[in-house]
């Protein structure tokens, strides 16, 4: 896997340990927590990043209406089980044998159960709605300039092809970025929208996952775009399965 040859670091993931022990003395980087080799020319999967985060010392840390099936990550951090490709396993369990099913971005999509709970497949999150509120500015941003800059950001910083940025909506001070990526659309080598959204979320929080690269400095025509609130909604190809008790709560 590629990494900076000279100082042997991983530009796309600072939560790695790198050493020149790859074939021919090439730099190879492994994710903290899992020890899995990562490809440093692209984003690391969210599952491996969450696992690394949980293993790290604790101090290292026209608007669209979301569909009724949209999920929000209310459960927060957990130590996930990842498959050999670094994807979330469909079933996640904690140390007390409480289990639940997750989607491809690792967000719970069923009620919690016990070890008998079955999660037949990893359901793909095909639509992500990133809802941002920006800090007050002298005037509203120009919508087309904002759209262009956000598309460029996802392309250049997160290597997400612009075709997966379905739309950028803006009603000051709310910005919504829609990412869409069906299973059939995602080709080998394409960055997953879930991984791009996670890197973006961490960037917005000032917790960049990139090694040596500056923090996120988002500007529209030279004017800084500073985000004060972020909410992310996840829509799966198959609607989630929660009991009526939760739905009416």
């Amino acid at each position: 896997h590629t990494a900076a040859q000279d100082n042997c670091t991983c530009p796309t993931n600072k939560m790695t340990v790198c050493s020149p022990d790859g074939p021919g003395g090439r730099c190879q980087c492994r994710a903290l927590g899992s020890g899995m080799a990562v490809d440093c020319s692209t984003l690391t999967s969210k599952c491996l990043l969450l696992k690394a985060r949980m293993s790290a010392p604790k101090n290292a840390r026209t608007l669209v209406r979301p569909s009724e099936h949209a999920l929000v990550d209310n459960d927060g951090l957990y130590d996930p089980d990842c498959d050999p490709e670094g994807r979330f396993k469909a079933r996640q369990c904690n140390q007390t044998s409480v289990c639940w099913c997750v989607n491809s971005v690792g967000v719970r999509r069923t009620d919690k159960g016990d070890l008998s709970l079955r999660c037949d497949e990893l359901v793909r999150t095909h639509h992500i709605l990133i809802d941002l509120r920006h800090r007050p500015t002298a005037g509203a941003f120009n919508h087309s300039d904002l759209d262009a800059e956000l598309r460029r950001l996802f392309r250049e910083r997160y290597r997400l092809h612009p075709k997966f940025v379905a739309a950028v909506h803006y009603e000051q001070p709310t910005i919504q970025i829609e990412l869409r990526q069906n299973t059939s659309q995602k080709a080998a080598g394409d960055v997953d929208i879930g991984d791009a959204a996670y890197y973006f979320e961490r960037d917005i929080k000032g917790e960049s996952l990139f090694q040596g690269r500056g923090g996120l400095d988002l500007r529209v025509r030279g004017e800084p775009l500073q985000v004060e609130r972020t909410l992310i909604y996840y829509l799966d190809e198959i609607p989630p399965k929660f009991s009526m008790k939760r739905l009416t709560a």
Partner: antibody, heavy 118, light 109 residues
Amino acid sequence: QSLEESGGDLVQPGASLTLTCKASGFDLNNYSILWVRQAPGKGLEWIGSIYISGGSTYYANWAKGRFAISKTSSTTVTLQMTSLTAADTATYFCARDDGTASYYLNLWGPGTLVTVSS
Amino acid sequence: YDMTQTPASVSEPVGGTVTIKCQASEDIYKLLAWYQQKPGQPPKLLIYAASDLESGVPSRFKGRGSGTDYTLTISDLEAADAATYYCQQAYTIGNIDNSFGGGTEVVVK
């Protein structure tokens, strides 16, 4: 798959000109089209680009304000140039990215010559 | 993200080796391409991602580098390799003057 530029001409200083890039054999959507120029005996100079599906446009710092790229049909992209000077004399190429998130240009048109002279 | 390419011109005999250097003003994370251009023709993509060979390009062309420093090496030079070669940073199109290096003319004696 091919690209072809047209509209190159001999024009007076201060004039405006519109160049057209026509795509054949592939769907323009999901690609970016970039305009690059080359003055006689000089190197390549990036002018700007458009991401077709989203319509977003981007320009080199020196090209902002005087050059405008737009998609005019399902197969054509134009480059509008205003206030032309002798320094704009060049062969103008349109090129397509490779369909990835990077800007590697794997398909080029043959170019069209623009001469600005009185 | 200025791209500085050296040398401006180089001359080598058939069978020789040429190395062209390209330096970016900032880290471009291996997002670099090399193009070959012959007189009267548009540029042709040779190498992308700093070291990956475009389909149909002979393995005599070798790209390497990371960070800000990149090289293109052409070994076993052939007469057909006489051309001008350009590097291009493929990382960003934001707030730049040009994404291409100044070019290197390769003369094959």
